[in-house]
Every structure is written in C-alpha cells, then in structure tokens.
C-alpha cells in the first residue's frame, strides 16, 4: 500500500482551511480522549478512480468520498482519519486530515474526497474513515467502513494500467486447445514480442471432481525475433486413465518485467459428454 | 504456509557433484509436478529440469545427461543430482512448484575452473 506520488496532498475547500498528514493509524485521541466528539462519516462511497504520477504511470486509486451529518456536532470536528486496510495481507495505511480552522454550517453539506491511495489489481480492501477525535471509550462509534474490491487485469480499464501491462495484461495469447487421438491435447497459443521463455501448464481433473489426477508442465524456450506475434504449437500427452478427462491448460509468461510472476491464461476442456444410455428393458415382468 | 526450502549448494570443482534438496512444508510434493529452476548473474531465469506427477522428467538443453531430477514423497522432497559440474552451472538454483506458482528462495552453486 502507498500514496500516489508525494506531491503537496491538499484537503482545503471554500471556508476550510484543511492539510493532509501521514499518519501512524493511532491518532492521539485514542490515548487522550476528548469529552466532546464529533458524529460519523455519512454517505461513504469508494469507487475505482484512475490517476497519473508525475512520471506519467497510470495506477488505479481508491476514491473515498464522504460527507458531514448536518448536526452541531461539527463544531467538535478537527479532522478525519482515512485508513485503507489491504485484507489478504493486513496491511493498513493511513492519512490525516487536519482541520486548521473551525467549520460552520453552511447551505451546502459538507463534502470531503481523497484519490490518492494506490490500490493493487485483483485486491480487496477495507477503508474506514474516522471524525476527529475518535470516541471515549464507550462513546458511539463515529467512523464508517466499507470494503472495496478492485477488478483483475481483464478488466478493460485496469488492462492499460501500469501494474497490469508490467505484469503483461497487453499479451492475448488467444489459447485455443484440441483433443486429438491416443490421448493427446494439441495446444496452440500467439507469442508475444519478447524474446522470453513460456511454460505449458496441464492439469488434469476427474469428471465432478476438484482433486488432480495428473499435473505436467512443457518447457518452451524463448522464441527468436522472427517468431514473435506467430503461433506456437505443442503436442501433449495425457495420462492414459479413464474419467480423468476434464484438462485446464495455463500458459506462464516469464516475461522481463514480471519474471516468475506473470499473468496467466487459461483454457479448460470438459469431459466429453457420455450418450444418455436408455434403461434396458427387462425380458420379464415379475409378478410382485 | 506454504514453504519450498532448497539445500545442498556450495562451492565444486569443476567435474564433480553436488545433489540440491527441496523439502516442502505446507504444502504435499506427491502427485505433483515440480520443476527445478537456475539463475545466472545478468541473464533469465531457466529451466533445468522438471518431473511430472507421474514421474515423467524433462530436463534443459544444457544439462540434459548430466543433471537428474527425483522425488522422495515419504520425505516430502524434490532431489537434483548434478554430476559433471562446469563453471558454467553456477547459478542460484530455485525450486518451483509451477502449477502453484509456489518458489522457494534459492541456494547458490559456484563451480570452479
């Protein structure tokens, strides 16, 4: 988890004066709580944004927007923290919005947004925003939380993002698979425009089943210059072994700026389908 | 966790032997294919060898005869035998479980002149 750049970040608006801090997550009102607090967040929202560093790299962006109650206790608000929480990993960021002057009622509701935490494809995240200063121990809660969950890499707009085409989101390698006779699956895929090594991928599954019956991998070397953009064809053998029919077929890319990590593509083929077979018809009726 | 641990490299004269162990844990080795992987200073990752969960082998170019890739499932560990060494095997050598994308961190092998 990081921010977008380290450019002024800026939380002032029209009769606000406002600045954004980095935070430890632990604001001080945790440890010195304040008699009077003030009420929630209301009306998060969190939408996927996208947004250019200074070096002209796309990255997607969480977008949190939230507004004020309209109750007096804006008068108590000195500020807002913003927590991103990356759930499979558990790490959490935070930023601070410092009020540097009191707010007052006016005849617009209060509205605050930050695009500026960069978020990973294919991840989820909880974001919580806090009013400033939190709660007594027992006091309501005056946060709001709501998980956010962003697209992988097909989707079409995170595919032109930076993190995706580094992980190689651009290459379609078009995966088309055959079965052929003796228990053979011809494999054939587009190459792309590096001169890197591939791996073939086969796994193999019982008809209803999820536990492998057989997993094999076939090396191709790194295509010349010439090859690139044409197809590669390969050949597989597959265990001869009855109802272990249902193939998924992964290719991996090393490509230079992903390495062991590149994104995969996959195609599955079903078991092919078993002729319904009529009841036999018995050659007597028993009497009972 | 899963956890892919190699062993047994280390520094050979040219000509002799080393045998790289990899012990999982979290993770069963059984019925899996398994892949032994190399990294020279300056150039790609590449294949040295790899076994099928069947026990079907295939091994790179530049070690075929040479290098031989097994498995202990009682011991849950994927074994390379390297005989033969020359200069020109030094690398990082990784452990890889390729339909899981699971790697482990590598153990060096430096070969001598």
């Known amino acids: 988890l990081r921010l977008l750049d380290h450019r002024a970040l800026v939380c002032s608006q029209p009769g606000l004066n406002c600045t954004v801090k980095n935070s430890t997550c632990l604001d001080d009102s945790w440890i010195h709580p304040r008699n009077l607090t003030p009420s929630s967040p209301k009306d998060l929202q969190i939408q996927l944004h996208f947004a250019h560093t200074q070096q002209g790299d796309l990255f997607p962006v969480a977008h949190i927007e939230w507004t004020l109650q309209t109750d007096a206790s804006i008068l108590y608000l000195e500020g807002a923290e913003l927590s991103v929480l990356q759930l499979n990993t558990n790490e959490r960021l935070c930023v601070r919005f410092e009020f540097l002057s009191k707010l007052r009622h006016h005849h617009r509701r209060w509205r605050f947004t930050f695009s500026h935490f960069v978020v990973d494809p294919d991840q989820e995240y909880e974001v919580t925003v806090h009013h400033l200063p939190k709660p007594i121990p027992d006091g309501d809660p005056n946060h709001q939380s709501k998980n956010f969950l962003v697209p992988d890499c097909e989707h079409a707009r995170m595919k032109v993002t930076t993190p995706c085409m580094s992980s190689g989101s651009l290459w379609d390698p078009n995966i088309t698979v055959e079965t052929l006779e003796a228990h053979q699956l011809r494999v054939s895929f587009t190459l792309w425009n590096e001169s890197t090594h591939y791996q073939i991928l086969l796994t193999s599954f019982p008809h209803m089943e999820n536990h492998s019956c057989f997993e094999h991998m076939h090396h191709i070397p790194a295509p010349r210059p010439e090859e690139f953009h044409q197809r590669s064809n390969v050949t597989l053998t597959l265990r001869n072994l009855k109802g272990c029919c249902r193939h998924q077929v992964q290719i991996q890319p090393f490509f230079s700026s992903c390495l062991n990590d590149c994104l995969r593509h996959s195609a599955t083929v079903s078991c092919p389908e078993m002729p319904d077979t009529p009841e036999p018809i018995p050659d007597y009726m028993p009497l009972w | 966790e899963v956890q892919l641990v190699e062993s047994g490299g280390g520094l050979v004269q040219a000509g002799g032997s080393l045998r790289l162990s990899c012990a999982a844990s979290?993770?069963?080795?059984?019925?899996?294919?398994m892949a032994w992987y190399r990294q020279a200073p300056g150039k790609q990752r590449e294949l040295v060898a790899q076994v099928n969960s069947i026990g079907s082998t295939n091994y790179g170019d530049p070690v075929k005869g040479r290098f031989t890739i097994s498995r202990d499932n009682a011991k849950n560990t994927v074994y390379l035998q390297m005989n033969s060494l020359k200069p020109e095997d030094t690398a990082v050598y990784y452990c890889?479980?390729?339909?899981?994308?699971?790697w482990g961190q590598g153990t060096q092998v430096t070969v001598s002149s």
């Open positions: 979290g993770f069963t080795l059984s019925d899996r294919a």
């Open positions: 890889n479980a390729p339909l899981y994308n699971y």
